[in-house]
């Protein structure tokens, strides 16, 4: 790290070290030899999240319902608002500036991981012995029916999209 002229939480102005403004406050005037740094609290719907020398506070993020957004955590003078997506939707980026509908897993695929407000549905192909016959954002691959346990036999083999079809056993007379 290069050397710094001031202490932590200070800044250099006109060869003078001045205190930075604390989070939640903005700079009104720099210190002088005889006066301290003057800071003012951020207004309603504004914030600053670091020790700073900003002359303007940042606006809280707006969670636009037209983009599928809603407030997850209300902002304070020291923190920004955190947005998330409405039920059934997820964020398109880490910043969560817009939302898209969770994708459904097509027949032949099941849900490996259900979507959250920040991640999409993760699908996986149904392996041998499992099937999914619906397009769903929640359904996992289901195991084929076990005909044997019902004292039945397989009449039609299952696929990744269909269950097996069971039927009665042929009885020898």
């Amino acid at each position: 790290e290069p050397p710094t002229a001031c202490r932590e939480k200070q800044y250099l102005i006109n060869s003078q070290c001045c205190s930075l403004c604390q989070p939640g406050q903005k700079l009104v005037s720099d210190c002088t030899e005889f006066t301290e740094t003057e800071c003012l609290p951020c207004g309603e719907s504004e914030f600053l999240d670091t020790w700073n020398r900003e002359t303007h506070c940042h606006q809280h993020k707006y969670c636009d319902p037209n983009l599928g957004l809603r407030v997850q955590q209300k902002g304070t003078s020291e923190t920004d608002t955190i947005c998330t997506c409405e039920e059934g939707w997820h964020c398109t980026s880490e910043a969560c500036e817009s939302c898209v509908l969770h994708r459904s897993c097509s027949p032949g695929f099941g849900v490996k991981q259900i979507a959250t407000g920040v991640s999409d549905t993760i699908c996986e192909p149904c392996p041998v012995g499992f099937f999914s016959n619906v397009s769903s954002a929640f359904e996992k691959c289901h195991p084929w029916t076990s005909c044997e346990t019902k004292d039945l036999v397989v009449q039609q083999a299952g696929t990744n999209k269909t269950d097996v079809v069971c039927g009665p056993q042929d009885r020898l007379r």
Epitope: R7, Q16, C17, C18, S19, E33
Partner: antibody, heavy 126, light 107 residues
Framework: QVQLVQSGAEVKKPGASVKVSCKAS????????MHWVRQAPGQGLEWMGW????????NYAQKFQGRVTMTRDTSISTAYMELNRLRSDDTAVYYC???????????????????WGQGTLVTVSS | DIQMTQSPSSVSASIGDRVTVTCRAS??????VAWYQQKPGKVPKLLIY???KIQSGVPSRFSGSGSGTDFTLTISSLQPEDFATYYC?????????FGQGTLLEIK
Amino acid sequence: QVQLVQSGAEVKKPGASVKVSCKASGYTFTGYYMHWVRQAPGQGLEWMGWINPDSGGTNYAQKFQGRVTMTRDTSISTAYMELNRLRSDDTAVYYCARDQPLGYCTNGVCSYFDYWGQGTLVTVSS
Amino acid sequence: DIQMTQSPSSVSASIGDRVTVTCRASQAIGSWVAWYQQKPGKVPKLLIYSASKIQSGVPSRFSGSGSGTDFTLTISSLQPEDFATYYCQQANSFPITFGQGTLLEIK
């Protein structure tokens, strides 16, 4: 009462490293910057840098950049200064010195040293 | 870096004398100056900070003044225990810099 107790004298060969310790007592160790100042025989005082024991943040004089490392162990209220690649002109008494309280300074850097360690003589000689 | 130039580099004086040591900064530094006393083989002792504030426990015969670039340490009536080396130090910005020292000797 406030005390800064330093480790004992060291004799080192050129190119070696030395690590000096400074154990603080009688006050809240994490509440004050700790500085290191050295004094060559018959010479004046030379500032080397500081460590914030609370955050671990450091600031070194340009002259010592890349050769000095200041660390601390808050569990035993001790600050350390390690100087590498020693030369004969590093022969000096090394002092730790306590600064003003962390929240106290509003302009200037307020680095007035009210308490000093007893000093550690480091002799660099082949 | 801010240079601190002390004068004189040495001064001889007698008990009871008034002694003045000056320090000039290479740029304006407000009132961010300290003065230290150091006796041979001893640790520096803070006498004055913020140019004119006297450190707790320091005798009132020591005083400091000045702002901007010119600073003064005054000992109003020299006592036997005052014979030592005196250093000024700027605390305006890092790197901290000291004057080269003024040796106060018995005449």
